[in-house]
Amino acid sequence: AQNITARIGEPLVLKCKGAPKKPPQRLEWKLNTGRTEAWKVLSPQGGGPWDSVARVLPNGSLFLPAVGIQDEGIFRCQAMNRNGKETKSNYRVRVYQIPGKPEIVDSASELTAGVPNKVGTCVSEGSYPAGTLSWHLDGKPLVPNEKGVSVKEQTRRHPETGLFTLQSELMVTPARGGDPRPTFSCSFSPGLPRHRALRTAPIQPRVWEPVPLEEVQLVVEPEGGAVAPGGTVTLTCEVPAQPSPQIHWMKDGVPLPLPPSPVLILPEIGPQDQGTYSCVATHSSHGPQESRAVSISIIEPGEEGPTAGSVGGSGLGTLA
């Protein structure tokens, strides 16, 4: 079968090979498309409700005044010339529609380095077949699921026209110290070949580099955190940030019911005071930051105290 590609809404003429150029003609067109079940026969004498979709012209060709999605399929003509020689024509018709130029909507003006950001949503409306959307960074294709790139795609079909709307949401994690003004664009590639891609206008969000937070230091006195019963332990939370953040205290991972203070004094230490302590500095701009954890223990008389207190895990990172 000869492959024919026709644009939706445009007319299409299929020639019936071997047919006499004018009536009387012995020919028959058979259609197997989205409008038929099995084969529909159209003849030159036909004329009728099918004329709006396909009709046989005086020269034997089949005329489709405005091709639609339902006209995809097989078209066959069987003709006999004046000498009784039979000729068959066979066509496979596929249809397409080029969408409007894709657009990037809900685009971000600023991205934060080191964390996932939504760049924007690329939208293409009115394609057939569906086709695909792809993203580009500085002109080069972005590959989903690589280097902090993720793409969420959605395809919808219009209930009446049958045309497709595609949506593609791009998320990226910009590298620290990377390009401060990356250029993103999106392109639509048609489902049928031989048609070039359509590209959106580019967007250039700024990349904001968050200032790395300095560590919250926890100083324990006596050093090592080991003390005789009845002794005193002083814990001091040192935060370089300005303005000074609020400091809260934790024991064994549970907040202590105390007012905010950079210093925690534990007088007359008893067994109930033993445990792991840390402080949490809450910044208005950055959220909470926890110090390393220190272990406070009681040395029984005659017991050698450790030279340095046992220290818990790194305790760094941000509280959820």
Partner: antibody, heavy 119, light 107 residues
Framework: EVQLVESGGGLVQPGGSLRLSCAAS????????MTWVRQAPGKGLEWVAS????????YYPDSVKDRFTISRDNAKNSLYLQMNSLRAEDTAVYYC????????????WGQGTLVTVSS | DIQMTQSPSSLSASVGDRVTITCRAS??????VNWFQQKPGKAPRRLIY???NLADGVPSRFSGSRSGTDFTLTISSLQPEDFATYYC?????????FGGGTKVEIK
């Protein structure tokens, strides 16, 4: 809202003529085939004539061929039926309907206009 | 010409009944059959298009089905407003032809 309003019906003598009109609104008139359907008193529905959206092609059953002519004026969103050589058996309510090709069938109908052929 | 033989020509039923009306085409008409409802003194109203599709604004108790050249209109639970005359139409070929109609009356 799609609206079809017929007019022009009335009493006419056998052999006489009458012209029916149908005013269409609420849709893009030149995108659709249009059709006349009739219904004799107490009887069923009968197709009378169809015309394609451009007005270039017209279709009739044998019962009215050469006597009735369907036409349209897309600029005026109007459909017409010229009826000549009227017979008693043409007495019916005449409906204007949108469609008539395989894409639509008939989806909207007017309220009808009564044509009585009698001496 | 394609004949559309509609049966029954009339039927009596009660509210809540399931009602089935059939049209048989004398030759293949594909899916190109519509069903209409008509009440006395009113224009026909399309219920089903292309054999099985419910027209806009038509209650879901109406449905259409097809088996070859046999077409069926079903009303799953008859309501008081459904007492009317029903017609099928084939629009696959000229002349376009209607079934003879089925009058649904109150039992």
């Amino acid at each position: 809202e799609v609206q079809l309003v017929e007019s022009g019906g009335g009493l006419v003598q056998p052999g006489g003529s009458l012209r029916l009109s149908c005013a269409a609104s609420g849709f893009t008139f030149n995108n659709y085939w249009m059709t006349w359907v009739r219904q004799a008193p107490g009887k069923g529905l009968e197709w009378v004539a169809s015309i394609d959206n451009s007005g270039d092609n017209t279709y009739y059953p044998d019962s009215v061929k050469d006597r009735f002519t369907i036409s349209r004026d897309n600029a005026k969103n109007s459909l017409y039926l010229q009826m000549n050589s009227l017979r008693a058996e043409d007495t019916a309510v005449y409906y204007c309907a949108r469609g008539g090709d395989i894409t639509t069938g008939f989806d909207y109908w007017g309220q009808g206009t009564l044509v009585t052929v009698s001496s | 010409d394609i004949q559309m033989t509609q049966s029954p020509s009339s039927l009596s039923a009660s509210v809540g009944d399931r009602v089935t009306i059939t049209c048989r085409a004398s030759q293949d008409v594909g899916i190109y059959v519509n069903w209409f409802q008509q009440k006395p003194g009113k224009a026909p109203r399309r219920l089903i298009y292309r054999a099985t599709n419910l027209a806009d604004g038509v209650p879901s108790r109406f449905s259409g089905s097809r088996s070859g050249t046999d077409f069926t209109l079903t009303i799953s639970s008859l309501q008081p407003e459904d007492f009317a005359t029903y017609y099928c139409l084939q629009f696959d070929a000229h002349p376009l032809t209607f079934g003879g109609g089925t009058k649904v009356e109150i039992k």
